[in-house]
């Protein structure tokens, strides 16, 4: 069951997302709770995802997400990543919230989630260049698979934003 509803950002009365798509969750007591994502966002588990069609630098992509009260995608599980891959276009690359600011191969997620080398999804022979400090998801034809690739942060790419579901 879905419905649309205005969301007011309570602190500033600023309308950030004017339309939500909500799913009713059955609660143990008489109350009804709604779990919502902004219109045109994808819903998976406890998060909402926005897949951009415009290209921008990593820095501007991060700000574009912030303007929507979100952040660049932080990948926590294989399942989450597989869901994202299903919604991407194979001919494009998409910035995620992983970067190496100093070029020392010290990878950092934008939300401070610890970088775990054992649960990464780099393409073979990636990361390849310490001057490529930002990460994209892209599709390679041989072998046919999605994965991570390091790229120059100033090169424009599409991106994926993530936010927690809104509960009403």
């Amino acid at each position: 069951q879905k419905y649309s509803q205005l969301l007011e950002k309570k602190t500033t009365k600023e309308l950030v997302h004017t339309t939500l798509e909500c799913v009713k969750k059955n609660m143990p007591v008489e109350e009804t709770a709604w779990s919502c994502c902004p219109k045109n966002w994808k819903s998976f588990s406890s998060n909402c995802y926005f897949i951009s069609t415009e290209s921008a630098s990593w820095q501007d992509s991060e700000k574009d997400c912030a303007r929507m009260e979100a952040h660049l995608l932080v990948i926590n599980t294989q399942e989450e990543q597989d869901f994202i891959f299903q919604n991407l276009q194979e001919e494009s690359a998409y910035f995620v919230g992983l970067s190496d600011p100093e070029g020392q191969r010290h990878w950092q997620w934008v939300d401070q989630t610890p970088y775990n080398e054992s649960s990464t999804f780099w393409h073979p022979r990636e990361p390849s260049d310490p001057n490529e400090r930002c990460v994209v998801l892209n599709f390679r034809k041989s072998p046919k698979r999605w994965g991570w690739n390091d790229v120059n942060c100033l090169g424009p790419q599409r991106s994926v934003c993530e936010m927690m579901k809104i509960h009403l």
Epitope: Q59, E62, K63, S99, G103, N131, R133, L154
Partner: antibody, heavy 119, light 107 residues
């Protein structure tokens, strides 16, 4: 260490053209945007715009569109600011400044190039 | 465009005093704000970024604070080398405008 070294002072007449250089060293040039800032005598700082050093794409603030042009010589890690058809009000010190990796704030600055336009 | 209103335009203080400079923005810039110090005849130097993070090598008597549209730079126990001009600048959306500046003079 990281350095931005600018070309020397310029004295020009109205209508002439000037080209100011900013040579970067101590870091990978194409990883950081290069900004230009104007400071007229006794006045505050005005952002002129920046160049994406990876794509070469310039961005100009509206007030500086038309006569101002940014360019790059990537192999020499050098950025340029050219001002055409100089006017008296272009008299100022021009700074280049590196844009930080993530947030764009200006973490390193050149020493400034003083441009005087006078007939 | 985001407008930056910096105050005061000038300020006289003595060594050892504490001063505060403020910067008000016309829209929420979500802490995308930097503070710079500029001495006479020199290039500006980064003091604070992301509204409250001190740049490398900046003494701890400097401190940035604020959020939304209101930001401040506080200098505790002023030292002789602290006198000069101070500017705020936002990085939320282009153009990345500067505040008008604050001239900090010795009383």
């Amino acid at each position: 260490q990281i350095q931005l070294v600018q070309s020397g002072p310029e004295l020009k007449k109205p209508g002439e053209t000037v080209k100011i250089s900013c040579k970067a060293s101590g870091y990978t040039f194409t990883n950081y945007g290069m900004n230009w800032v104007k400071q007229a005598p006794g006045k505050g700082l005005k952002w002129v715009g920046w160049t994406n050093t990876f794509t070469g794409e310039p961005t100009y603030v509206d007030d500086f569109k038309g006569r101002f042009a940014f360019s790059l010589e990537t192999s020499a890690s050098t950025a340029y600011l050219q001002i055409n058809n100089l006017k008296n009000e272009d008299t100022a010190t021009y700074f280049c400044a590196r844009g930080n990796f993530r947030y764009y704030y200006f973490d390193y600055w050149g020493q400034g190039t003083t441009l005087t336009v006078s007939s | 465009d985001i407008q930056m209103t910096q105050s005061p335009a000038s300020l006289s203080a003595s060594v050892g005093e504490t001063v505060t400079i403020t910067c008000r923005t016309s829209g929420n810039i979500r802490n995308y704000l930097a503070w710079y110090q500029q001495k006479q005849g020199k290039s500006p130097q980064l003091l604070v970024y992301n509204a409250k993070t001190l740049a490398d090598g900046v003494p701890s008597r400097f401190g940035g604070s604020g959020s939304g549209t209101q930001y401040s730079l506080k200098i505790n126990s002023l030292q002789p080398e602290d006198f000069g001009n101070y500017y705020c600048q936002h990085f939320w959306s282009s153009p990345y405008t500067f505040g008008g500046g604050t001239k900090l003079e010795i009383k």
